[in-house]
Interface confidence: low
């Protein structure tokens, strides 16, 4: 049933999913309904290399979240790569992050009970000018 | 119980939490857990402004949706902004697009059942380098 | 002038524990990620714990996970880590560091040192 | 974790002569490598970061190479305050780990 990438036994501590009294409960449908024609854009895939703020992914991988993988950004360098290819250290690249929805086995291992958490993940990075304070 | 932030009545043609022949369901504890101590983070949010691909934020609801309040980025420029201030249309502000997982309500307006889904948002912009496509 | 000036460090038994400050001065604390090192006796560095601008993002060495905690007040231009159920081989001098990048992420490069303050874990 | 192996483990050269320590990794760090200089009582000194770049205030003679898993920390010309502890430190991969030192002493 759960599409986590996994097969986990019944567990028998885990709670009975036609329990009325279950905490702020919902039922969720995990036949997933694919909003976008395209699910993994070549196009913007390719923006991590000819970015300015260029950035290499990382795989996390967690059995016991849904969805089990998720790719996190990081920033290739400390600076911003200028048109004849070197690092300009007066910029920096920076990751820009969101926050996102997952699902949480809970308790652990649980095959059809969730909960619903909140991850902050770096997408990629973008080139930004650095705080300057100016001394009066 | 649910966190959209309406409250919708009982619809009668919502299916029944306890059926046990509801397809591909789990149980989801909407409490939801942050994992972040801050959920709008600062630096992040100044970015937009000190990128040298620029982006304004979007409000992106529906009430039909949880979250039902997504920021979407729009890049401000095709180019991107140079140290002078001016934009430089040898290079492209490009949004960084990433999928993301939202509950919507199914059969509609029901408050405890939801499908899981799959959009597609635009988190921030970089500034890419364009692909040049050189004729023999 | 940037300065980092840790305190805190002490004698302690096994088991108990410390708090170490942080004291930041002469740059904007809240600009930058702030880091904790520590170094043993005779030993190398070793990286203990980090934190970014906004507490956003925490990361811990395993060898401390579970057991110490860092925070800090960007109101008090202040570091802090909490160590709870100290060990001998907890015994270093601690130095507070300053992340390079003005961007209020980890980058961990280190460019701005405490003198160090001494924790000893002795019974 | 990724392991920094810092060699020689003691290098002994006299001043005015070149200084070359090395750092290699145990998996490709890309260039994500700084070096940091610790003098006896005191508190390290970002030298390097990003494996090439000289942080701020630190002398043209000291420079950073390499990329992937072997890097070089080269002294052009040593200078009596020079001899000190050496060491690399990773950024690629969490958790961030620093190599064993190099002692640099006097002749």
């Known amino acids: 049933i759960v599409k986590a990438g996994i097969a986990i036994p019944r567990n028998s501590g885990c709670p009975n999913s036609e329990d009325k009294n279950f905490p702020r409960t919902v039922m969720v449908n995990l036949n997933i309904h694919n909003r976008n024609t395209s699910t993994n854009p070549k196009r913007s895939s390719d923006y991590y290399n000819r970015s300015t703020s260029p950035w290499n992914l990382h795989r996390n991988e967690d059995p016991e979240r849904y969805p089990s993988v998720i790719w996190e950004a990081k920033c290739r360098h400390l600076g911003c790569v200028k048109a004849d290819g070197n690092v300009d250290y007066h910029m920096n690249s920076v990751p820009i992050q969101q926050e996102i929805l997952v699902l949480r086995r809970e308790p652990r291992h649980c095959p059809n009970s969730f909960r619903l958490e909140k991850i902050l993940v770096s997408v990629g990075c973008t080139c930004v000018t650095p705080i300057v304070h100016h001394v009066a | 119980i649910v966190k959209a932030g309406i409250a919708i009545p009982r619809n009668s043609g919502c299916p029944n939490s306890e059926d046990k022949n509801f397809p591909r369901t789990v149980m989801v504890n909407l409490n939801i857990h942050n994992r972040n101590t801050s959920t709008n983070p600062k630096r992040s949010s100044d970015y937009y402004n000190r990128s040298t691909s620029p982006w304004n934020l979007h409000r992106n609801e529906d009430p039909e949706r949880y979250p039902s309040v997504i920021w979407e980025a729009k890049c401000r420029h095709l180019g991107c902004v140079k140290a002078d201030g001016n934009v430089d249309y040898h290079m492209n502000s490009v949004p960084i697009q990433q999928e993301i997982l939202v509950l919507r309500r199914e059969p509609r307006h029901c408050p405890n059942s939801f499908r899981l889904e799959k959009i597609l948002v635009s988190v921030g912009c970089t500034c890419v380098t364009p692909i040049v496509h050189h004729v023999a | 002038e940037v300065q980092l000036v840790e305190s805190g460090g002490g004698l302690v038994q096994p088991g108990r524990s410390l708090r170490l400050s942080c004291a930041a001065s002469g740059f904007t604390f809240d600009d930058f990620a702030m880091h904790w090192v520590r170094q043993a006796p005779g030993k190398g560095l070793e990286w203990v714990s980090g934190i970014n601008w906004n507490s956003g993002s925490i990361g811990y060495a395993d060898s401390v996970k579970g057991r110490f905690t860092i925070s800090r007040d960007n109101a008090k231009n202040s570091l802090y880590l909490q160590m709870n159920s100290l060990r001998a081989e907890d015994t270093a001098l601690y130095y507070c560091?300053?992340?390079?990048?003005?961007?209020?992420?980890?980058?961990?490069?280190?460019?701005?040192w405490g003198q160090g303050t001494t924790v000893t874990v002795s019974s | 974790e990724i392991v920094l192996t810092q060699s020689p483990a003691t290098l002994s050269l006299s001043p005015g002569e070149r200084a070359t320590l090395s750092c290699r990794a145990s998996?490709?760090?890309?260039?994500?490598l700084a070096w940091y200089q610790q003098k006896p009582g005191q508190a390290p000194r970002l030298l390097i970061y990003d494996a090439s770049n000289r942080a701020t205030g630190i002398p043209a003679r000291f420079s950073g190479s390499g990329s992937g898993t072997d890097f070089t920390l080269t002294i052009s010309s040593l200078e009596p305050e020079d001899f000190a502890v050496y060491y690399c430190q990773q950024r690629s991969n969490w958790p961030p780990t620093f190599g064993q030192g190099t002692k640099l002493e006097i002749k």
């Open positions: 998996q490709s760090v890309s260039s994500y």
């Open positions: 560091a300053k992340d390079i990048a003005a961007a209020g992420e980890f980058y961990f490069d280190m460019d701005v």
